[in-house]
Amino acid sequence: EDELQVIQPEKSVSVAAGESATLRCAMTSLIPVGPIMWFRGAGAGRELIYNQKEGHFPRVTTVSELTKRNNLDFSISISNITPADAGTYYCVKFRKGSPDDVEFKSGAGTELSVRAKPS
């Protein structure tokens, strides 16, 4: 039995330059206890996009909409999208550890592609 599922329902999202991109992520449980972070890319070189607990992410807002009892919404919106934002975004659950939190489970990823700004 899975302890928790990380659900990124959209494999890909296409957004026009200058618009906002909504990246969806839902989880089935808060347990194990620990933070949720968003990254672009995978592996050692991945880029932190959003961490609720610390850091400054002026282009990112949270967009929780799900009110179902067994779906916790950890979706984000990134404003003013540029071609440099293209890539695959991962919603990642961490488990509280000592001294450092441990990566527990990642969503399957959502590929963001950026269309040219309509003229």
């Epitope: 039995e1 899975d2 302890e3 928790l4 089935t28 449980s29 808060l30 347990i31 194990p32 206890v33 620990g34 933070p35 949720i36 609720q52 949270t62 967009v63 929780s64 009110t67 009892r69 067994n70 779906n71 916790l72 919404d73 950890f74 979706s75 984000i76 488990r95 509280k96």
Partner: antibody, heavy 118, light 112 residues
Framework: EVQLVESGGGLVKPGGSLRLSCAAS????????MSWVRQTPGKGLEWVAT????????YYPDSVKGRFTLSRDNAKNSLYLQMNSLRAEDTAVYYC???????????WGQGTTVTVSS | DIVITQSPASLAVSLGERATISCRAS??????????MHWYQQKPGQPPKLLIY???NLESGVPDRFSGSGSRTDFTLTINPLQAEDVATYYC??????????FGGGTKVEIK
């Protein structure tokens, strides 16, 4: 119909042990986070322990950490709380509670009373 | 620990009127726009019953005269209109990432 039935409470001397059980029915037990919450007239409601749906992760407040151990048997739809080194301040009604998402407690049992006294 | 201050400790309201209960947390219980504050009703001799989850979501089967609002540190449970069967003690509970999870001290609601 969801049912949570606690058992195992009773009178025990300080320093003694008790094992509480909670039998669950009416829902998919193995998908739910399970907890114990206790209630005393003086202190109100106090969270005691939580275990993840698969049983891998357990959490306790400092007041019981190292003395209480929470476990579950998903094949038997059962939850267990082993309470050791009991103190007078552990006297309370102990409720078993389920949570589909690990946040709010959806359903509660009727409770079992634990009295720690010499 | 996150301390929850619940007020008032007791409340007497006329039938058909509005009852309002407040809970204030010592720090934010929000994450990703969700508020991990919940409300329960407990009648004498019974276990608590979930009314509202995540600040404002009505639990299935709960009458819509119960409503919840608030975010971050300040939360409110409203019963409007109050009915005789609502006489009970009400508790708030936070389940944020910051353990331990904690409860408010309770509010006893009576009929005036």
């Amino acid at each position: 119909e969801v049912q949570l039935v606690e058992s195992g409470g009773g009178l025990v001397k300080p320093g003694g042990s008790l094992r509480l059980s909670c039998a669950a029915s009416g829902f998919t037990f193995s998908s739910y986070v399970m907890s114990w919450v206790r209630q005393t007239p003086g202190k109100g409601l106090e969270w005691v322990a939580t275990i993840s749906s698969g049983g891998t992760y357990t959490y306790y407040p400092d007041s019981v950490k190292g003395r209480f151990t929470l476990s579950r048997d998903n094949a038997k739809n059962s939850l267990y709380l082993q309470m050791n080194s009991l103190r007078a301040e552990d006297t309370a009604v102990y409720y078993c509670a389920s949570s589909v998402d690990g946040s709010a407690f959806d359903y509660w049992g009727q409770g079992t009373t634990v009295t720690v006294s010499s | 620990d996150i301390v929850i201050t619940q007020s008032p400790a007791s409340l007497a309201v006329s039938l058909g009127e509005r009852a309002t209960i407040s809970c204030r947390a010592s720090e934010s219980v929000d994450s990703y726009g969700m508020s991990f504050m919940h409300w329960y009703q407990q009648k004498p001799g019974q276990p608590p019953k979930l009314l509202i989850y995540r600040a404002s979501n009505l639990e299935s089967g709960v009458p819509d005269r119960f409503s919840g609002s608030g975010s971050r540190t300040d939360f409110t449970l409203t019963i409007n209109p109050l009915q005789a069967e609502d006489v009970a003690t009400y508790y708030c509970h936070q389940s944020s990432e910051n353990l331990p999870w904690t409860f408010g001290g309770g509010t006893k609601v009576e009929i005036k």
